[in-house]
């Protein structure tokens, strides 16, 4: 049998049974997250699980730029440090850096100092570059 | 009830540079909004300039970015505008404004300054 | 030249209905909201409609917005004599990552 490759929506990059689209138009996060979804196929704000998919995408985005940070589906919606992803994924691969995390930033981004590898938190309502991601 | 104020010269010299602060009172600059520079030549329409988060990051319209430079002072509460090497195109009246996040979505100018004018001539 | 299109002037009788209209592109009104200012002689412009059909708290319900595919519209029904003003259309543009306005349409009453 010969096992076809499913394909992504045009402008989107797959990896490991995902679709991932990087947008370069300015959205705050939940306006990014609304927008994931409206390209259907129960697209969310990105999901980063292990080193392996961060280090594809990261190596993608840097394609494109390497100074503007993009949103990613990590968010704190109790404002209690309790993360989660908004597609429902396990919290279990983490890879903050080490800036500090206090103050009103609920909501991760993919950070531009570390070639996109780590991550920070920022204020949900800054306009930024963001990342969505599907499984086809 | 958040209030704006723009202050600076009114009048600065050709190739000069045009230098504006917007004094905000009744909220903080430190808010999650961003702060907007909005200009109107004389009876002419509206041009947006650029726009400022309190942590220093900004957007600037592409076609003056080589020109704008914004900052923010959270000490103050106040925010700024430079626009260099001005012409008499950039002759206007300049307004402050703060910017809040829709709860559907999208952004809007909720409060704005009274304006400043703003001649370029020698 | 305005990257959205407003015709530069509108009128009506008091009363009346009047539509003012906004056109743009894929990459502005296609994507995002529309937000709609009014600016009295004079005086700062002043939000009246944001998110494309939101009514601000100070505007009248006589004033109702509308999108369709990458145009917008003002409509003010019930005019009134202190609705002659001028308005700007506005929105965010993907492409250049800013916020672009229409000309300004001058409405009167007449």
């Known amino acids: 049998d010969i096992i076809m490759r499913p394909s992504c929506a045009p402008g989107w990059f797959y990896h490991k049974s995902n679709c991932y689209g990087y947008f370069r138009k300015l959205r705050n996060w939940s306006d990014a997250e609304l927008e994931c979804q409206s390209y259907g196929n129960g697209a969310h704000l990105a999901s980063i699980l292990s080193l392996k998919e961060a280090s594809t995408i990261a190596e993608y985005i840097s394609g494109y730029q390497r100074s503007q940070p993009i949103w990613i589906g990590l968010h704190d919606p109790q404002k209690r440090q309790q993360w989660q992803w908004i597609d429902g994924a396990m919290y279990l691969y983490r890879s903050w850096s080490g800036k500090s995390m206090g103050g009103n930033k609920h909501c991760a981004e993919m950070s531009s100092n570390n070639n996109f590898l780590t991550w920070s938190s920022n204020e949900c309502n800054k306009r930024q570059h963001f990342l969505c991601k599907y499984r086809p | 009830q958040v209030q704006l104020q723009e202050s600076g010269p009114g009048l600065v010299k050709p190739s000069g540079t045009l230098s504006l602060t917007c004094a905000v009172s009744g909220g903080s600059i430190s808010s999650s909004n961003y702060w907007s520079w909005v200009r109107q030549p004389p009876g002419k329409g509206l041009e947006w300039i650029g726009e400022?988060?309190?942590?220093?990051?900004?957007n600037y319209n592409p076609s003056l970015k080589s020109r704008v430079t914004m900052s923010a002072d959270k000490s103050k509460n106040q925010f700024s505008l430079k626009l260099s090497s001005v012409t008499a195109a950039d002759t206007a009246v300049y307004y402050c404004?703060?910017?809040?996040?829709?709860?559907?979505?999208?952004?809007?100018?909720?409060?704005w300054g009274q304006g400043t004018l703003v001649t370029v001539s020698s | 030249q305005s990257v959205l299109t407003q015709p530069p002037s509108a009128s009506g009788t008091p009363g009346r209905r009047v539509t003012i209209s906004c056109s743009g592109s894929s990459s502005n009104i296609g994507s995002n909201p529309v937000n709609w200012y009014q600016q009295l002689p004079g005086t700062a412009p002043k939000i009246v409609m944001y998110?494309?059909?939101q009514r601000t708290s100070g505007a009248p319900d006589r004033f109702s917005g509308s999108k369709s595919g990458t145009s917008a519209s003002l409509a003010i029904t019930g005019l009134q004599s202190e609705d002659e003003a001028d308005y700007f259309c506005a929105t965010w543009d993907d492409s250049p990552n800013a916020v672009v306005f229409g000309g300004g349409t001058k409405l009167t009453v007449l």
């Open positions: 400022i988060y309190h942590d220093g990051s900004t």
């Open positions: 998110s494309t059909d």
């Open positions: 404004a703060r910017d809040s996040p829709s709860y559907s979505s999208g952004w809007y100018s909720d409060y």
